[in-house]
């Protein structure tokens, strides 16, 4: 019983890590940028894997996306492959583990075929989510070293050769999301590990015994009752991105409760 | 069509306060922020300060921080503009003005004149 | 606060000329996560509110007429005039829309000679 909850339980768990590393993998607000210190300005921007957004007081925003390879930063390509990476070995490792599940029957599966896919999703939840966190780090580091860099920039004499203001970034929401939805894919595939180890079946040194009474016989064999609970997570499908077929996004976004103004 | 719709002229003592409405129409007034901007006789324009009708945050300029205060009314769908402490250098025709793209004004109150004399 | 100051104060200009006005800001309206500059021009007719005419510096408003034009970048820019019209006579303020507080030029008399 605690095998299957310990299953079901790192199943869980990685399925919500894996929804979140793909949301955060799509969220815009990978950067943003930094309002303290500085002056404050009517306009917001924020930078994410795949475009990069400005947010006017007016409500009105609008999104560009790098319709560039070659002119983007090793670092931002990278980070997008671990993003993948990480989904992508995530996928399979859920769709793995659903035939893993104890509570599942599938056939006449052997306990030791679902121990054995139960430590490959696990492992797969455990590289998924490692390539998850190492993005997202990667992303963090490479913020940080920028932003020391601008701030240098500011308090260095440039002259009237600057033509823009210093737009300095920082840690944007999707960063954190990130973070914690790999902790959780990691979490869930150590999980799976564990529930493994469970799954295995131990060789046993009897044979089934008979025991004869009279009037009527029973056979009675170890090893118990297979659960037949329909162990099932019934969670809606959310759209989490729209990537669209626009070549440029302008949307009037209307102020909302939360934005500034 | 957009249209804002200003109250009417009024004539006040130094160190009293005044309040302006300005009822907009034509479009959702929670989806635009109001922005108030004055103007002195024979002067140019002075931004005062905008509020986001949907939230109610406001944004003032620090030179009338403390004596302009802008709200909204949603059920009315009215923005007011309350200046206190006024003097004789407030005389002036106050405006509220829709932000649009670009925090531009796109669409503006006919004026309301506001005088100060004792 | 910004400071935007407008040259000349007042242009006179034969109908059929062209009329350019200078706007010049104390720090770069140039916004680098999109590249825009933040830069309104507006026309004011006496005794009516101000009329916006092209935003982002050289982004015409609907229904304006294609003989006004903006341009600059950073913290210089120009409204110009192609053709002068007897209507076109107004005040035109340049304002800064990035910075808080929003600050306006201090006009620019457009008269016939």
């Known amino acids: 019983m605690a095998v299957t909850a310990c299953q079901g339980l790192g199943f869980v768990v990685s399925l919500i890590g894996i929804a979140g590393i793909i949301a955060a993998t799509c969220m815009d607000q990978w950067s943003t940028q930094d309002l303290y210190n500085n002056p404050v300005t009517a306009v917001f921007n924020y930078q994410g894997l795949w475009r990069s957004c400005v947010r006017e007081s007016s409500g009105f925003t609008e999104c560009r996306g790098y319709f560039t390879l070659l002119g983007l930063p090793a670092m931002l390509q990278a980070v997008r492959a671990l993003m993948i990476v990480g989904i992508v070995l995530g996928a399979i490792g859920l769709l793995v583990s659903i035939f893993a599940l104890k509570c599942i029957r599938i056939g006449s599966m052997e306990d030791s075929a679902k121990a054995n896919m139960t430590l490959t999703s696990g492992i797969m939840f455990i590289v998924s989510g490692l390539c998850a966190i190492a993005g997202v780090s990667v992303f963090a580091n490479m913020l940080v070293t920028n932003f020391w860099m601008s701030t240098a920039n500011m308090y260095t004499g440039m002259g009237g050769m600057v033509q823009t203001v210093q737009t300095r970034y920082t840690f944007g929401a999707a960063l954190f999301v990130g973070w914690v939805a790999g902790g959780l894919t990691l979490i869930g595939g150590v999980m799976m590990c564990i529930a493994c180890r469970g799954l295995a079946p131990e060789e046993t040194n009897y044979k089934a015994v008979s025991y004869h009474a009279s009037g009527h016989s029973v056979a009675y064999k170890p090893g118990g009752f297979k659960a037949s609970t329909g162990f099932g997570s019934n969670t809606k499908n959310k759209k989490i991105y729209d990537g669209g077929a626009r070549t440029e996004d302008e949307v009037q976004s209307y102020p909302s409760k939360h934005d500034y103004v | 069509q957009v249209q804002l719709v200003q109250s009417g002229a009024e004539v006040k003592k130094p160190g009293s306060s005044v309040k302006v409405s300005c009822k907009p129409s034509g479009y959702t007034f929670t989806n635009y922020l109001i922005d108030w901007v004055r103007q002195a006789p024979g002067q140019g324009l002075e931004w005062m300060g905008g509020?986001?009708?949907?939230?109610?945050?406001?944004v003032y300029n620090e030179k009338f921080q403390g004596r302009v205060t802008i709200t909204a009314d949603e059920s009315t769908s009215t923005a007011y503009m309350e200046l206190s402490s006024l003097r004789s250098e407030d005389t002036a025709v106050y405006f509220c003005?829709?932000?649009?793209?670009?925090?531009?004004?796109?669409?503006w109150g006919q004026g309301t004149l506001v005088t100060v004399s004792s | 606060d910004i400071v935007m100051t407008q040259s000349p104060d007042s242009l006179a200009v034969s109908l059929g000329e062209r009329a350019t006005i200078n706007c010049k800001s104390s720090?770069?309206?140039?916004?680098?996560?999109?590249?825009?500059?933040?830069l309104t021009w507006y026309q004011q007719k006496p005794g009516q509110p101000p009329k916006l005419l092209i935003y982002w510096a050289s982004t015409r408003e609907s229904g304006v007429p294609d003989r006004f034009s903006g341009s600059g970048s950073g913290k210089d820019f120009t409204l110009t005039i192609s053709s002068l019209q007897a209507e076109d006579v107004a005040v035109y303020y340049c304002?800064?829309?990035?910075?808080?507080?929003?600050?306006f030029g201090g006009g620019t008399k457009v008269e016939i000679k």
């Open positions: 509020i986001n009708p949907g939230s109610g945050d406001t």
């Open positions: 304002q800064n829309n990035y910075f808080y507080p929003l600050t």
């Open positions: 720090q770069s309206l140039l916004n680098s996560g999109n590249q825009k500059n933040y």
């Open positions: 003005a829709r932000r649009v793209r670009g925090n531009s004004f796109d669409s």
